[in-house]
Amino acid sequence: AVNGTSRFTCFYNSRANISCVWSQDGALQDTSCQVHAWPDRRRWNQTCELLPVSQASWACNLILGTPDSQKLTAVDIVTLRVMCREGVRWRMMAIQDFKPFENLRLMAPISLQVVHVETHRCNISWKISQASHYFERHLEFEARTLSPGHTWEEAPLMTLKQKQEWICLETLTPDTQYEFQVRVKPLQGEFTTWSPWSQPLAFRTKPAALGKD
């Protein structure tokens, strides 16, 4: 059960959570594994139980404190180990010296709302969640709009290369139902990746005024 291809990936949400995924081809579903976190300059150690999320994949969250507390900085190093039970002993399956601000994945943006909607335009705002104050304005966003008869994958990506928590969508069709999503990424970190997409916000453009083209 230990000879398959394995992969261990973790991301820091910039505040008080390190989320990890451990995958291993050929591993037994009932294998008992944990992630151990051992920081270099903090008094705490943390462990989380890896729970199955698919046939050969397990995940867990290291909760370091209250959601908005700043538990790690750019100078911290947290050694992360995957330990799996083999009979009566634990075997180390993976180890990495984790630099939190090189491996960022923020929470999805929240509180999406329509600020103003017209026949052809819609102004939408959102908020970032549990994002470190260290970033100041060094964030970027991607947004996409789902049009009728299309899929999310077909939706063109709009890039906002600055910390701008609103967008004005234009050239929309009157009296039409749309959905909108946004995601965020810090500029910092070699292995940093996009946040999950926000929950979709549904909105409808105003109908065209009667008697006008």
Epitope: S6, T79, A94, I95, Q96, K99
Partner: nanobody, 126 residues
């Protein structure tokens, strides 16, 4: 581009010591796990030791455990292998190797290596 340049090899008598160095460039050294591997004449590549990005985790092949020490200096972007109590069977070309991520997998130490240097010859003979 990634470059790994080994040095410090040479000829030594059994029981002697050598310290190998590997100068790395072209990538953020501290973000990657590293290892030493070796190839004896007429043999395949053999894993020797691995180290995590900041040296907080190290691992050794049974054949060198207690005699070799892997370490790194991230300020100088350099990997080291201190070899003590050398034996004739340690004779090989020693290569420094970079892993493709910050993660090292102890059950499969060869996995994930994406670059290695040109090697430095170590000969142990009386």
């Amino acid at each position: 581009q990634v470059q790994l340049v080994e040095s410090g090899g040479g000829s030594v008598q059994p029981g002697g010591s050598l310290r190998l160095s590997c100068a790395a460039s072209g990538f953020t050294f501290s973000n990657y796990a590293m290892s030493w591997v070796r190839q004896a004449p007429g043999k395949g590549l053999e894993w020797v030791a691995s180290i995590t990005g900041f040296g907080r985790g190290t691992d050794y092949a049974d054949s060198v455990k207690g005699r070799f020490t892997i370490s790194r200096d991230n300020a100088e972007d350099t990997l080291y292998l201190q070899m003590n109590s050398l034996k004739p069977e340690d004779t090989a070309v020693y290569y420094c190797a970079k892993y493709s991520s910050s993660t090292y997998y102890p059950p499969t130490p060869a996995r994930g290596r994406d670059y290695r240097g040109q090697g430095t010859q170590v000969t142990v003979s009386s």
